[in-house]
Amino acid sequence: LVPHLGDREKRDSVCPQGKYIHPQNNSICCTKCHKGTYLYNDCPGPGQDTDCRECESGSFTASENHLRHCLSCSKCRKEMGQVEISSCTVDRDTVCGCRKNQYRHYWSENLFQCFNCSLCLNGTVHLSCQEKQNTVCTCHAGFFLRENECVSCSNCKKSLECTKLCLPQIENVKGTEDSGTT
């Protein structure tokens, strides 16, 4: 099966790599603009230069292109705890990330929030915190994992999944509050 190509991809595929087909004259292939620049004017004819201009401050193009405008630089979302790792340049967008001992939780493909890595109190670190994943904890005896925190078995209700992990404690407890810890 031939993959479906958009009009622009169809037009570009007629020209060799690094060139694009002139929008008004499909017998002319113009050289694409380098990253950090955008298309100001198409080339007037075969073998003639494309008029490319450098992106203005606050905008960029990260690859060779024939865009009529540069792309606006992204802004890091302070309300999501994001910090700027590297600022925007004419050929690279802003890079946003999280502070040390934090990880990214992706709300959507294009949006992440920074959360503190779990410290595994009352447990041990099974897998260290990574850029896009929280620490994975293993809990000590008498504790069970809830929302990646080690919680005392005294907080385990019979209806919850913790009953398997806390079963000995629950059977010994018979309703007393302080019995879940070992």
Epitope: H105, W107, S108, N110, L111, F115, E147, N148
Partner: nanobody, 122 residues
């Protein structure tokens, strides 16, 4: 077909409370992050709150922090927004939205409800 149906809006006095609900169908509710977004009259969209698929992580806009609580019941395929200490500036149409995880083409949300109007006035 994905459907998000909000309910619970209405007229409330300043300082009052409301609980919005969003019944979801047509997709595996438990597999997606969900959120509430609002649009005040003549203004742009504002993110209100998000909740992750497990109900463990939440996000709140500064304007609603400490007053609104987002929650979900995965067994009922329902998203909630408990709104307390309501103010006139909370007046808006509130939309339930599914957050997009793949092939989003720059968008944060891929499906929205029709919205429910919340009016805070004395």
């Amino acid at each position: 077909e994905v459907q998000l149906l909000e309910s619970g809006g209405g007229l409330v006095q300043p300082g009052g409370s409301l609980r919005l609900s969003c019944a979801a169908s047509g997709f595996t509710f438990v597999a997606y992050n969900m959120g509430w977004v609002r649009q005040a009259p003549g203004k742009g969209l504002e993110w209100v709150s998000f909740i992750d698929m497990y109900g463990a992580k939440t996000y709140y806009a500064d304007s609603v922090k400490g007053r609104f609580t987002i929650s979900r019941d995965n067994s009922k395929n329902t998203l909630y927004l408990q709104m307390n200490s309501l103010r006139a500036e909370d007046t808006a149409v509130y939309y339930c939205a599914k957050l997009c995880l793949m092939d989003c083409s720059g968008d944060i949300f891929d499906y929205w409800g029709q919205g429910t109007l919340v009016t805070v006035s004395s």
